[in-house]
């Protein structure tokens, strides 16, 4: 886990509301775990951050992630330039100035130090329709989700509607 206090002392002040020129509608500090209750942890190695999926020891503290939720207008296909509703997107930041980032070329999920405004690769469309879990779909690559592969996070292509329920793209959010 990060050996820095910022992850536990997150405040709104650390993330001003200039991200992509819009303010998050809400922010939430939570631990992230898989459908099978493995924890997502972040470690500093050789001056870069690695993301792991692992079982924690009984009293080991879970790493927290700041989830910032944004709404974007969803254009209506039927009504020309009208608006259907909203797409709920999220950015995930485990420590100040670092965000989860989709690397579509490598099919990987990485932690990048990003300048604001954040790039589209840092935004994920939120799904919440299965087993009170959430899924994170790449804004830049629809149909591709953050998932678990070989004890790491990876980008996983979901082909059919049934596969949206596949356990390796489902995550749990917890305040504890």
């Amino acid at each position: 886990a990060f050996g820095i206090s910022g992850v536990q002392k997150y405040t709104r002040a650390l993330h001003d509301s200039s991200i992509t020129g819009i303010s998050p509608i809400t922010e939430y500090l939570a631990s992230l775990s898989t459908y099978n209750d493995q924890s997502i942890t972040f470690a500093l190695e050789d001056e870069s951050y690695e993301i792991y999926v692992e079982d924690l020891k009984k009293d080991e503290k879970k790493d927290k992630v700041l989830l910032s939720y944004y709404e974007s207008q969803h254009p209506s296909n039927e009504s020309g330039d009208g608006v259907d509703g909203k797409m709920l997107m999220v950015t995930l930041s485990p420590t100040k100035d670092f965000w989860l980032h989709a690397n579509n070329k490598e099919h990987s999920v990485e932690l990048h130090k990003c300048e604001k405004p954040l790039p589209d690769q840092a935004f994920f469309v939120l799904h919440n329709m299965h087993s009170n879990c959430v899924s994170f779909e790449c804004k830049t690559d629809p149909g591709v989700f953050i998932g678990v592969k070989d004890n790491h996070l990876a980008l996983i292509k979901v082909d059919s509607s049934e596969n949206l329920c596949t356990e390796n793209i489902l995550f749990k959010l917890s305040e504890t």
Epitope: G85, L88, H127, E162, C165
Partner: antibody, heavy 122, light 107 residues
Framework: EVQLVESGGGLVQPGGSLRLSCAAS????????MSWVRQAPGKGLEWVSS????????NYADSVKGRFTISRDNSKNTLFLEMNSLRAEDTAVYYC???????????????WGQGTLVTVSS | DIQMTQSPSSVSASVGDRVTITCRAS??????LAWYQQKPGKAPKLLIY???SLQSGVPSRFSGSGSGTYFTLTISSLQPEDFATYYC?????????FGGGTKVEIK
């Protein structure tokens, strides 16, 4: 203009079945989570069921699980609720509702139909 | 399941009054709370989503606040068309649940 029009309600005996339909127009139906919410006469609102835009994920209230089935036909912009083994306590106005968010119920329901009354009585 | 407790169950008020309705969740729901207005014989209407975001077309006299387990809906200056029943709804987890409703009546 978004429109949701329910149909299929009526009087049915306990143990009977009904199929409710909700015809949607004015928005990209297949992009949105859709739900059924009911309201017993003189009572409050009760969520019944939700279905994802592609139909791959569904959720149900415990009170209807195993008896009701939600489905959708995106080619016809129609939402369904198949209701079996109906009980007196299922008597209510049933509303079809569109989620404000495309892929999530986190933002609530921004459009509702006018409702269709289901009466379960012998 | 998450229980939503609304109070008061009814309130008598006059045009121009400030009205506040509260909603408590039995466990934390972040900011995933919606408020609806319902008039007799009509479908509910979304007023507020994500605890404090005003739905398009809703007058600015309506406002929402709160997070976690405690939320409020405030009508800053009650208008004749605001006499109705108001419901909160937690949108955080399934099963989705509504509060019991607050009826705003004419004093």
């Amino acid at each position: 203009e978004v429109q949701l029009v329910e149909s299929g309600g009526g009087l049915v005996q306990p143990g009977g079945s009904l199929r409710l339909s909700c015809a949607a127009s004015g928005f990209t139906f297949s992009s949105y989570v859709m739900s059924w919410v009911r309201q017993a006469p003189g009572k409050g609102l009760e969520w019944v069921s939700s279905i994802s835009g592609n139909g791959g994920s569904t959720n149900y209230a415990d009170s209807v699980k195993g008896r009701f089935t939600i489905s959708r036909d995106n080619s016809k912009n129609t939402l369904f609720l198949e209701m079996n083994s109906l009980r007196a306590e299922d008597t209510a106005v049933y509303y079809c509702a569109k989620s404000l968010g495309t892929t999530t119920t986190f933002l609530g329901f921004d459009y509702w139909g006018q409702g269709t009354l289901v009466t379960v009585s012998s | 399941d998450i229980q939503m407790t609304q109070s008061p169950s009814s309130v008598s008020a006059s045009v121009g009054d400030r009205v506040t309705i509260t909603c408590r969740a039995s466990q934390g729901i972040s900011s995933w709370l919606a408020w609806y207005q319902q008039k007799p014989g009509k479908a509910p209407k979304l007023l507020i989503y994500a605890a404090s975001s005003l739905q398009s077309g809703v007058p600015s006299r309506f406002s929402g606040s709160g997070s976690g387990t405690y939320f409020t809906l405030t009508i800053s200056s009650l208008q004749p068309e605001d006499f109705a029943t108001y419901y909160c709804q937690q949108a955080n987890s399934f099963p989705l649940t509504f509060g019991g409703g607050t009826k705003v009546e004419i004093k």
